[in-house]
């Protein structure tokens, strides 16, 4: 056919315009074209032509007569997409073809599951509420709002703002409670996120707050606590940052803390914890129990030759710790503790108030008077020195038979003995634990020979008790374990003295160093028990005032006492020992004076104090179970040098929960120590000990390692 | 008409490779993913993967990776799937399946039999 | 992935029984279940999409309901033209239920 002159070739009037449906929903594209003859419409996706009903009837898109697209419902899967896409609708006649300008058609989507639900929140009044939420991924990409308790929230109130997907209330109130939705919208329609609570709970706050109290002793205190909260507050006490110990405390029903009884160990902060879901408050009060002042060690009379030392022990407690100051009496002068020493003067007082005078004239001789002084009372205690020519000084008491370990039934009857010799006589008094016994017990009574008897025996009677003999001499302390149960013997067993090895004979003296005497001695009468073994015993004025165990276990009738000072005269005595217990004493040996030694230089040259450390070499005896809770460790020492300060005696548990702990140490700070008790051990455990010398920062080489095991129950006799 | 042809009956070694076609006619190829099932003499129907014509874009489930190929030649609206590394067990029927904007296989091939057989 | 467990794996009904298969999925998968009907030799064939929409061109005796994990295909009145296996398939991950084959009784 040939060219009309009215023909002209397609022009599109109408471009189709982008557009966003819904999935499943109906849409148009549209296209209108001018032309003549009458232009025909395809449409392209992507580039690729579109099938609709005039290729397959049964499609889901028609081209209308205008040279629309519609689409009778959008598809669109998870996958295939076939209807989304950018469109062009082209309009051909034979004169030419026209192209539309794209139109994108997105479909539409708003899955289900949110990507972020809301969840329960608590807050504490005052705080702000943070609700976040994630909405369904969708397209458009979904705005949100905020239902509580089904009603939409208007986020002009000043205190509420949403942003992102975030509602957050600034300064929440009881009234912001309830159940809170979140909305994810588009022109799909609208999902509800799962409903999450917002609860509003209060802080405790005290109403009332415990009050510093300053009480004394014996006296009753309460501790007032009184708060609210939503939820109720939980109030617990602690005592200086522990739990409250057990049995000493009541709490009532409105939480006060009330103590019938103060003691001195009640003193300390105690905090009211408040606690609920949303916070926790405490609040604190000291207790301080004012407690008179008491005698730990009373200073007692002593007879001391002239140029010799004498220390008048006094120690005191009390709350506050009671100020200890010492005068003669008939002398204006008082002496306090950490004076500086005044020229020319003797005296001096320790920290811990232990009158110490070097020296001794005869002028020293009188009544010394030990005063301790505090807010809650004053006491005071007088000791008289006699000062004699005589040279040899007396030796300490010496106690023939002390107390053996024992266990006896309830309702039983003990007998601890002591029987006790020295010049001037000695005077025998008992501790229980370290304190004073019998005190007003009428159940205990010390009989004429200083027999501790207790009868109608209780089950709190159990512990240690110390027979102590005391002169102007000295004192001599011997221990033993009394443990009652419900199934020991009901009475003593009294060791008749035929049970027990004769005493030996007196020792005499073989060989003497500057730090070391050798005794012999022959074993007791014929016709006696023999004995398995010795102790040597030995006695120094200026070491100490009593007799101490300077060697265990012997098995020879010869043996080297070592680790002695130098210059220092002694006095030994030997006992027997065999199953049953310990013989009375051999007599005393003359005294015997250890070599001297040329003063060393002044200054200490480290290379010799290291070097004579290191030729130490300490003997570690096996150790002896006290009590299910103290072990006796005794050494001897080879080769005692002149630059040692004492003993690290060293044991760490090797058993139960805390195996192979850290070691802990017990230092014996006088050279001359060759024994130490470790107290507090736990029950039915094995330790490993071993002993150390130490000069300053040198350290000798570790003794051997012991194994012992502590007992369950104590050991009976 | 809408509809998918495949290749015909293939016998195959062990340890060979076999390559299947899969003809669309009838609708936008481009426009629907095609995927991939099996199904061994008297057992189920194992699906076997995707591929999206669109971009060549595909996807296997664990037991097939390594082993199957999924392509297309848009030009002639034909997607292929090649399994290597044959195996007796892998004796089955293959079909193609186009998936619809509904989430479904609404259109299959007719079924492709694959022997391996030494 | 998701597996699918369909029960009964074959039944024997009469022509005019309402059959039921059920079908479960080891986690939620809302309502992306589709069902199939296969004949011997055949390929097989779409019946039921998104859980419960009829494809065009099926009869109205097939239905499908369920959601979340479980799900059900039921055929109100058996015609012979039923006699077939049926599989279920999760549209997420795509994977097929074992299959159900009904028989004549």
């Known amino acids: 056919s040939r060219l009309r002159q009215e023909d002209f070739p397609p022009r599109i009037v109408e471009h189709p315009s982008d557009v966003i449906v819904s999935k499943g929903e109906p849409t148009t594209l549209n296209c209108k074209a001018e032309g003549r003859p009458t232009p025909t419409i395809e449409w392209y996706k992507d580039g690729e032509r579109v099938e609709t009903d005039k290729d397959d009837p049964r499609s889901h898109r028609m081209l209308l007569p205008s040279g629309s697209l519609f689409f009778l419902r959008i598809v669109h899967g998870r996958r295939s997409k076939p209807d989304e896409g950018s469109y062009v609708c082209v309009a051909r006649n034979y004169l030419g073809e026209a192209v539309s300008r794209n139109a994108s058609l997105e479909v539409a989507l708003l899955r289900d599951d949110f990507r972020q639900n809301p969840t329960d929140v608590v807050v504490a009044a005052g705080e702000p509420a943070i609700l976040e939420c994630q909405p369904p991924r969708g397209h458009p990409e979904p705005t949100i709002y905020w239902k509580k308790d089904k009603v939409r929230i208007d986020d002009k109130e000043e205190r509420i703002s949403i942003r992102g997907g975030k509602l957050m209330i600034s300064n929440t109130r009881k009234s912001d409670a309830g159940m809170y939705t979140c909305v994810g919208t588009n022109m799909v329609g609208e999902r509800d996120s799962d409903p999450a609570e917002l609860t509003v709970f209060e802080r405790p706050t005290f109403l009332r707050r415990p009050i510093n109290q300053v009480v004394l002793e014996e006296e009753a205190v309460e501790f007032r606590c009184q708060v609210q909260g939503d939820p109720q507050p939980t109030v617990r006490w602690k005592k200086d940052d522990a739990d409250l110990p057990r049995g000493r405390y009541d709490i009532k029903d409105d939480y006060t803390l009330r103590i019938k009884k103060t003691m001195s160990t009640d003193e300390g902060t105690y905090m009211c914890i408040a606690e609920n879901r949303v916070g926790k408050m405490e609040a604190s009060a000291t207790l301080t129990v004012r407690a008179p002042p008491q005698f730990v060690v009373r200073p007692r009379d002593q007879i001391v030759a002239q140029g010799r030392t004498v220390t008048f022990p006094c120690e005191t407690k009390g709350n506050p710790q009671p100020a200890v100051f010492w005068q003669k009496e008939g002398s204006q002068n008082l002496l306090f503790p950490n004076q500086p020493q005044q020229p020319n003067s003797r005296c001096s007082v320790s920290p811990t108030g232990d009158l110490t005078i070097t020296n001794i004239q005869r002028s020293d001789a009188g009544y010394y008077i030990c005063q301790a002084l505090t807010v809650a009372g004053s006491i005071l205690a007088k000791a008289q020195l006699e000062v004699t020519d005589v040279l040899t000084d007396r030796p300490p008491p010496i106690i023939l038979q002390g107390p053996a370990n024992q266990t006896l039934a309830v309702d039983g009857t003990a007998l601890l003995k002591c029987k006790a010799t020295g010049d001037p006589l000695p005077v025998i008094s008992w501790l229980k634990e370290g304190f004073t016994f019998p005190g007003r017990d009428p159940r205990a009574t010390i009989q004429e020979q200083g027999t501790l008897q207790i009868k109608n025996l209780r089950i709190s009677d159990t512990g240690t008790y110390t027979c102590v003999a005391t002169s102007s001499s000295g004192e001599t302390s011997w221990s033993a374990v009394l443990d009652v149960t419900e199934s020991g013997a009901t009475i003593s067993k009294n060791y008749d003295l035929s049970d027990l090895p004769g005493p030996p004979s007196k020792p005499q003296v073989t060989d003497v160093t500057k730090n070391s005497v050798t005794l012999s001695w022959q074993p007791g009468t014929p016709g006696t028990l023999p004995a398995s073994a010795y102790i040597i015993e030995a006695f120094s004025q200026s070491v100490s005032n009593s007799w101490q165990t300077v060697a265990n276990h012997v098995k020879t009738t010869l043996y080297t006492v070592r680790g002695l000072r130098p210059n220092t005269i002694y006095l030994f005595m030997v006992r027997a020992i065999n199953p049953q217990g310990l013989s009375d004493p051999s007599p005393m040996s003359d005294p015997v004076r250890t070599q001297d030694i040329s003063p060393p230089a002044q200054g200490v040259d480290h290379r010799q104090v290291q070097k004579e450390l290191g030729d130490v070499l300490v003997r570690l005896h096996n150790p002896v179970v006290l009590t299910p809770t103290t072990v006796q460790v005794t050494w001897t020492v080879d080769r005692q040098p002149q630059f040692i300060q004492g003993y690290r005696v060293m044991y760490r548990q090797t058993s139960g929960l805390q195996a192979t702990s850290s070691w802990q140490n017990l230092d014996a700070k006088v050279p001359t120590e060759r024994s130490a008790v470790l107290v507090n051990l736990k029950k039915g455990v094995t330790y490993e000990i071993k002993v150390r010398p130490y000069f300053n920062e040198f350290q000798g080489m570790d003794s051997e390692s012991k194994t012992v095991r502590t007992t369950e129950e104590a050991p009976s006799a | 008409e809408v509809q998918l042809v495949q290749s015909g009956a293939e016998v195959k070694k062990p340890g060979a490779s076999v390559k299947v076609s899969c003809k669309a006619s009838g609708y936008t190829f481009t426009g629907y993913y095609m995927h991939w099932v099996r199904q061994a003499p008297g057992q189920g129907l194992e699906w076997m993967g995707w591929?999206?014509?669109?971009?060549?874009?595909?996807e296997f489930p664990q037991k097939f990776q390594g082993r199957v190929t999924m392509t297309r030649d848009t030009s002639i609206t034909t997607a292929y799937m090649e399994l290597s590394r044959l195996r007796s067990d892998d004796t089955a029927v293959y079909y193609c399946a186009r998936e619809s904007g509904d989430d479904a296989f609404d259109i299959w091939g007719q079924g492709t039999m694959v022997t391996v057989s030494s | 992935d998701i597996q699918m467990t369909q029960s009964p794996s074959s039944l024997s009904a009469s022509v005019g029984d309402r059959v039921t298969i059920t079908c479960r999925a080891s986690?939620?998968?809302?309502?992306?279940l589709n069902w199939y009907q296969q004949k011997p030799g055949k390929a097989p064939k779409l019946l039921i999409y998104?859980?419960?929409s009829l494809q065009s061109g099926v009869p109205s005796r097939f239905s499908g309901s369920g959601s979340g994990t479980d799900f059900t295909l039921t055929i109100s009145s058996l015609q012979p033209e039923d006699f077939a296996t049926y599989y279920c398939?999760?549209?997420?991950?795509?994977?097929f239920g074992g299959g159900t084959k009904v028989e004549i009784k």
């Open positions: 986690q939620s998968i809302s309502s992306y």
């Open positions: 398939q999760q549209s997420v991950g795509l994977f």
């Open positions: 998104a859980a419960s």
């Open positions: 591929i999206n014509p669109k971009n060549g874009d595909t």
